[in-house]
């Protein structure tokens, strides 16, 4: 049987000769020469040689472990003069043994990595690994310990793991903000003789909302026209902030002072600038100048930082008004008067007033532009500015008079205003209802009672035009003794009614009905209205034979009975024929 | 249907005020003129004040002018009367009515008491 | 203050026939129309003739109006228990533009 084992050899051999392996040997060995050993498998014969006589096998070349750390190997003993295996062939493991040749390497050459400023000691910041080639299983070649070369006091970094924190407290980005940090890697557990590698780590330190606004100076003053209109920019003002991006956004706003109503203040998100703006018009009579107190806040705050004092700054804005000569103010920036349509002639409907802003305050006098009240119906009193009618008002006629009332500085007509003035006329129960139309109507001479021969219909010109609730009779004169009734249909119609049976046209071929009107409203309006009534010869059918001509021709036309049908155009035989009225024997 | 009704009314002593509201459905309120009239205790009937349509309008018994004031919000259908100075002779009960026919008051509430009395 | 004048009362038997009077002037009864109202106790008044002599629906034939020049009657025919009440004539006033009423009528039917 083979008397051997496996086999150890030593890495990176620097010796003249040829590295020593070890020996295969056979008990079958009598040490005459008879057997020859053999060689076969990885690098035999070329990496690996052995001595066919003695079995002792020698290495050539010098090896790496980290090239190929195990060399399998075949032997065999033979019978030099048979050439018969005296031993079965057997497979043998040459190991490469380590050395601590190589040094430990980073996975980047150069690490780039971002914390916040004012970050807590110990924050993590980023972690560099090195790796070892060296055989990790044997001895401490391929433990590597890390180490910081440059960098401290600001970091710091694990030894084992390579987690980079920060070392330092209290980093200002405003004060630095680039950090080269160089990080060892040392083998051997990092004792004397270990080899090393190292690694550069860009640190940038990101910026966090540690520095309020601050005014460059404490007090600006600036200067508008007192005609300057809302919105017009007044002047900028800058607050600095020594942060970047949205921790140095800038918020302005006026905190206090006697303009605050007067003045807007608004940020210019390009510039982070303040614009002081008008807000409302100005007057340089009332107030000459302002006194602002305008602050810069930042609207993104890091809650954490607010012990170090609030996050916003404060200075004095002056504003100084200039005077501009302007014409009268009127009170109002229009009028709205009601007066009675009822209302006698020189009735004082209201009042306008006008004032001249400017601190020499010129006397005004008031006058009508004639253009928009060119029948005089209204006038004012130059002096006090009082309207009053100068004639009769009619509602029906016009309901709003759209009049302009002209100010005009006694001392300079130049400067002079206008308001206009909408008088509403107010409507007064004062138009009585009437007939709708012209009412001319027929009934058969042998009409029954009670027969519908004309429905009326009553229109008033007051208000509401179409909301207006009538009520019919006939007048009392009439109503002991008329032929015929009024039917009050609670609809604003009525209708007139036969009241006996038969009338002769020989005795009375033409009655006229005086009906009363009356509103429901207050006070009560009512007129009387005449319904012409003919009477007319019918034939059994209910045809129409004779009228009195003129009841044909009336110019207004024909209102014709119930149940009849007229046609504008027909002949005069043909409205005979036209008008069908209901009739019983 | 017309319905008028009243609402308001109690006691009161004099010299103080009251209101008196009169709520109107069935018609088209705003088209009518509506009165006020009253009717003391074994007494007869007493118009008492009218508002126009409108409300532009308005008048008044000679007894109680200056100290009621009639009113209406046709946007609610109501008609009201506010009752100032109040003595003891405006005791009654009060009647919102409705003119029409006419001048004829066709419909009529069912009345509130008012009594004035210390 | 009363204008129209009424008298206080009148009375009749079942099926007998009363007349009540008012009396009014220019302003009112002689340029305008003329209403009556019936007003049974412990009720609202209730319109029974308007426009000086006509009757709205379901006011029975029985009773009936009518004017002339300043005055106006109300005829009930065919007196009925239920019609005992208490009468009121009414008018506009053109004059100051105002309603007025009669002091009312007491209607008493005897037996």
């Known amino acids: 049987s083979w008397m051997w084992n496996q086999f150890f050899l030593l890495e990176e051999y620097t010796g003249s000769d040829y590295q020593y392996v070890g020996k295969l040997h056979s008990d079958q060995d009598r040490g005459d020469g008879s057997l020859k050993y053999i060689l076969s498998g990885d690098g035999a014969g070329d990496l690996f040689i052995i001595n066919e006589n003695t079995g002792d096998i020698q290495a050539t070349k010098r090896l790496d472990r980290e090239e190929k750390p195990v060399y399998i190997l075949r032997a065999q003993a033979v019978n030099r003069r048979t050439g018969r295996p005296v031993e079965p062939e057997s497979e043998f493991i040459i190991k490469i043994h380590d050395i601590n040749d190589n040094e430990p390497i980073f996975t980047k050459d150069v690490y780039t990595a971002t914390v916040p400023e004012m970050a807590d000691v110990g924050t993590f910041v980023v972690q560099v690994t090195a790796t070892d080639a060296d055989d990790p299983t044997y001895g401490n070649s391929a433990k590597v310990v890390y180490s910081i070369l440059q960098g401290q006091p600001y970091f710091s970094v694990e030894s084992e793991t390579g987690i980079i924190k920060t070392a330092l407290l209290n980093m200002d980005r405003e004060n630095r903000e680039q950090y080269q940090v160089v990080i060892q890697a040392k083998d051997m557990g990092g004792q004397m003789g270990g080899l090393s590698g190292t690694t550069t780590v860009n640190i940038t330190l990101t910026d966090v909302n540690d520095n309020p606004p601050r005014f460059p100076q404490s007090t600006y003053q600036f200067k508008t026209p007192e005609s300057s209109p809302p919105g017009t920019p007044i002047g900028r003002i800058k607050a600095s902030d020594a942060d970047v991006g949205e921790n140095a956004e800038i918020e302005y706003s006026i905190t206090d002072g006697e303009g605050h109503e007067m003045f807007d203040v608004i940020t210019d998100q390009e510039t982070q600038e303040g614009i002081i703006t008008v807000k409302k018009l100005l007057d340089f009579e009332k107030k000459k100048v302002y006194t602002l107190k305008v602050e810069a806040s930042n609207p993104h705050v890091e809650p954490r930082f607010l012990y170090l004092g609030p996050f916003k700054d404060s200075a004095t804005v002056r504003i100084v008004v200039d005077d501009v000569d302007e014409p009268p103010v009127f009170s109002k920036l229009a009028y709205i008067l009601q007066i009675r349509e009822d209302a006698r002639i020189n009735t004082t409907i209201g009042s306008v007033a006008a004032q001249d802003p400017d601190a020499a305050r010129n006397p005004v006098k008031y006058s009508v532009d004639r253009h928009t009240d060119m029948d005089r119906i209204f006038n004012i009193d130059s002096g006090n500015g009082s309207i009053f009618t100068s004639k009769l008002l009619d509602r029906e006629t016009l309901l709003w008079h759209n009049i302009t009332v002209i100010a005009t500085e006694i001392n300079n007509p130049k400067q002079s205003s206008r308001v206009p003035l909408y008088i509403k006329v107010l409507d007064v129960n004062d138009n009585a209802p009437e007939f709708a139309e012209f009412y001319e109507t027929f009934v058969c001479e042998k009409a029954k009672a009670d027969q519908l021969i004309q429905t009326l219909r009553a229109v008033d010109k007051d208000d509401p035009y179409s909301g207006h609730q009538f009520s019919f009779s006939l007048a009392p004169e009439a109503a002991s003794s008329s032929n015929f009734t009024i039917q009050d249909n609670k609809d604003n119609t009525a209708g007139i009614l036969t009241r006996k049976n038969g009338y002769n046209r020989h005795e009375m071929s033409t009655y006229l009905l005086p009906v009363v009107i009356s509103d429901n409203d207050y006070p009560v309006q009512s007129s009387t209205g005449t319904v012409t009534v003919r009477v007319c010869a019918c034939d059994h059918h209910g045809n129409m034979q004779s009228c009195h001509a003129e009841a044909l021709i009336h110019p207004t036309g024909l209102s014709t009975g119930a149940g009849s049908e007229f046609r504008h155009d027909s002949g005069l035989n043909d409205i005979f024929e036209a008008q069908k009225i209901e009739w019983h024997e | 249907q017309v319905q008028l009704l009243e609402s308001g009314g109690g006691l009161v002593q004099p010299g103080g005020s009251l209101r008196l509201s009169c709520a109107a459905s069935g018609f088209t309120f705003s088209s009518f003129a509506m009165n006020w009239v009253r009717q003391a205790p074994g007494k007869g009937l007493e118009w008492v004040s009218v508002i126009s349509s409108s409300g532009s309008n308005t008048n008044y018994a000679d007894s109680v002018k200056g100290r009621f004031t009639i009113s209406r919000d046709n946007s609610k259908n109501t008609l009201y009367l506010q009752m100032n100075s109040l003595r003891a002779e405006d005791t009654a009960v009060y009647y919102c009515?409705?003119?029409?026919?006419?001048?004829?008051?066709?419909?009529w509430g069912q009345g509130t008491l008012v009594t004035v009395s210390s | 203050d009363i204008v129209l004048t009424q008298p206080p009362s009148v009375s009749g038997a079942p099926g007998q026939r009363v007349t009540i009077s008012c009396s009014g002037s220019s302003s009112n009864i002689g340029s305008n129309f003329v209403s009556w109202y019936q007003q049974l106790p412990g009720t609202a008044p209730k319109l029974l003739i308007y426009?000086?002599?006509n009757r709205p629906s379901g006011v029975p034939d029985r009773f009936s109006g009518s004017k002339s020049g300043t005055s106006a009657s109300l005829a009930i025919t065919g007196l009925q228990a239920e019609d005992e009440a208490d009468y009121y004539c009414?008018?506009?006033?053109?004059?100051?533009?105002?309603?007025?009423f009669g002091g009312g009528t007491k209607l008493t039917v005897l037996g």
């Open positions: 426009d000086n002599s």
């Open positions: 009515a409705r003119p029409s026919y006419f001048q004829a008051m066709d419909y």
């Open positions: 009414s008018s506009y006033d053109s004059f100051d533009h105002s309603w007025v």
